[in-house]
Amino acid sequence: EKLPKAPVITTPLETVDALVEEVATFMCAVESYPQPEISWTRNKILIKLFDTRYSIRENGQLLTILSVEDSDDGIYCCIANNGVGGAVESCGALQVKMKPKITRPPINVKIIEGLKAVLPCTTMGNPKPSVSWIKGDNALRENSRIAVLESGSLRIHNVQKEDAGQYRCVAKNSLGTAYSKLVKLEVEVFARILRAPESHNVTFGSFVTLRCTAIGIPVPTISWIENGNAVSSGSIQESVKDRVIDSRLQLFITKPGLYTCIATNKHGEKFSTAKAAATVSIAEWSKSQKDSQGYCAQYRGEVCDAVLAKDALVFFNTSYRDPEDAQELLIHTAWNELKAVSPLCRPAAEALLCNHLFQECSPGVVPTPMPICREYCLAVKELFCAKEWQAMEGKAHRGLYRSGMHLLPVPECSKLPSMHRDPTACTRLPYLDYKKENITTFPSITSSRPSADIPNLPASTSSFAVSPAYSMT
């Protein structure tokens, strides 16, 4: 009769590599007498004999996983016990190997230029797949803007037009490669004006063409506004080339106006717009005051409220469809331009512009606007804003578009009446008188004769030494 013998595992369990849906077998050969009872555990949890996912044969020495799932990963142990001595155990790992699989593929994306785009690409696989991206037919290179994240997603910071195109992600491990479908990244660009319409000073009855060029994706549409309303006359010609729209508005000029070009394009439910304005003025318009049609009334706007004299009547030009609104829009546009000028120039220019656009008015039978006195205009031009004026004229000559004051509706000083000829025929700017006395950076002041009735002037006369042309007394 055989002697009892404690169990000995003669073939210890080894690590088993298995592909998903394939068969995996662990062998646990045991020598013992009497025959042992063999049980199996996965991650220390007993595998039940009646679990149909497993097959246990050869008196329990063979464990077969019939169709491996990725959740079967873990440590498998066989435990042999026959009552003689202690139970013995051997363990081995099951590593579930898996070809790459893309679980969350990228989708088509529309993104606005400058924003961040993320194209997802979540993968599964063992070994863990490496993820790369292809744009068009070429492998995509990472840089400071473009990165493949740990998750496999592609992140593009500050999206540029050139990022548009077809993308696919590639997941690769030692067992194979998976490709996503091609997806499209479309980059949309806010409407932007490339070429703003230019302001014109023309004679009554001339033809003027205002040109406005805009770019954007999708291609913008351009509309024109005249003094705040849709353009009522004139013809518009448009052409589109390489996502650039060129619009030309031809006008027959019978009145001055503020013309605004508005470029608009749509991004989903939202619109982006860009605006640029130009003034069309009629040469000698302000000179022929007798022909001016308009009315005198109190100023109700916001922009010039602090500049114009309280309760003063100002002139509203009825050549505009809505004079109050048109003149307010002109001054508002001008005001924004003034943000660029120096602190010395700005208040003086504001005083000049407000009093030029909203001229003091004598009601009478024919409402008559009173232009600014030439001397005050020249003081702004040659003293307070000399630097800005020179820059503006220089840029205008070189054909450049905008410089602080370029688009401002500034008067032509030489055409304004002199306060020496008729002090009642023109408007003074008290601000300048006050500043003249209070700013120490002025040129030296000479005295020669008694002062006229200008607010805040001392009894002695003062003339700016810069030029006798604008002596303010």
Partner: antibody, heavy 121, light 112 residues
């Protein structure tokens, strides 16, 4: 079609607060001044507050100054009236109205249907 | 603060002409007050008729006209229609002290 739709009215106790909103559609909201006008039951119209197209200034009837605040969100095409320290004399239908131009003052060429504010204990 | 005055009530026969006025308790109404006129029928929101003294809003019948009459602003209805029976309000811009827009007390117009 141009529309102004007021909301936010209701019953509030004296000293309480309400915020009225006016949702605008059918026109370029940021090109126009806006106003609030109220009408007490059986009484006439009373201008309350105004704001220009860009929200750069605000104007109020003397009796509501310091208690009411008008504001606008041009992106949301919405006009607001925040009413604090409400009094029984503020009870009225509050109309939101559109100006015919950019500046705050002038003819009100489009009106909402109004929202009733009742201040009572 | 100045009060804007209007006739409390007026009546007119269909086809007749009626003039509503708008004054100031102190002083005259001028173009600087930019007189505006509104019509309100029961249960409805107001509707603007005339702005800045004499400009008619689009869609407003030509029988409505605005003007000055002495030191007041005036709204004239020439050839009154039954549907013109309503409350009429004038509103004035007051810019002198603090800026304000002031409505008159309204005129109840009856078309008999």
């Amino acid at each position: 079609e141009l529309q102004l739709v007021e909301s936010g009215g209701g019953l509030v106790q004296p000293g309480g607060s309400l915020r009225l909103s006016c949702a605008a559609s059918g026109f370029t909201f940021d090109d126009y001044g806006m106003s609030w006008v109220r009408q007490a039951p059986g009484k006439g119209l009373e201008w309350v507050s105004a704001i220009p197209w860009n929200g750069g200034s605000t104007y109020y009837k003397e009796s509501v100054k310091g208690r009411f605040t008008i504001s606008r969100d041009n992106a949301k095409k919405t006009l607001y009236l925040q009413m604090n320290s409400l009094k029984s004399e503020d009870t009225a239908v509050y109309y939101c109205a559109k100006r015919s131009g950019r500046i705050a003052f002038g003819a009100l060429d489009a009106w909402g249907q109004g929202t009733l504010v009742t201040v009572s204990s | 603060q100045a009060v804007v005055t209007q006739e409390p009530s007026l009546s007119v026969s269909p086809g007749g002409t009626v003039t509503l006025t708008c004054g100031l308790s102190s002083g005259s109404v001028t173009s600087s007050n930019y007189p505006d006129w509104y019509q309100q029928t029961p249960g409805q929101a107001p509707r603007a008729l005339i702005y800045s003294t004499n400009s008619r809003l689009s869609g407003v019948p030509s029988r409505f006209s605005g003007s000055f009459s002495g030191n007041k602003a005036a709204l004239t209805i020439t050839g009154a229609q039954p549907e013109d029976e309503a409350d009429y309000y004038c509103a004035l811009y007051m810019g002198s002290e603090s800026r304000n827009y002031v409505f008159g007390g309204g005129t109840k117009l009856t078309v008999l």
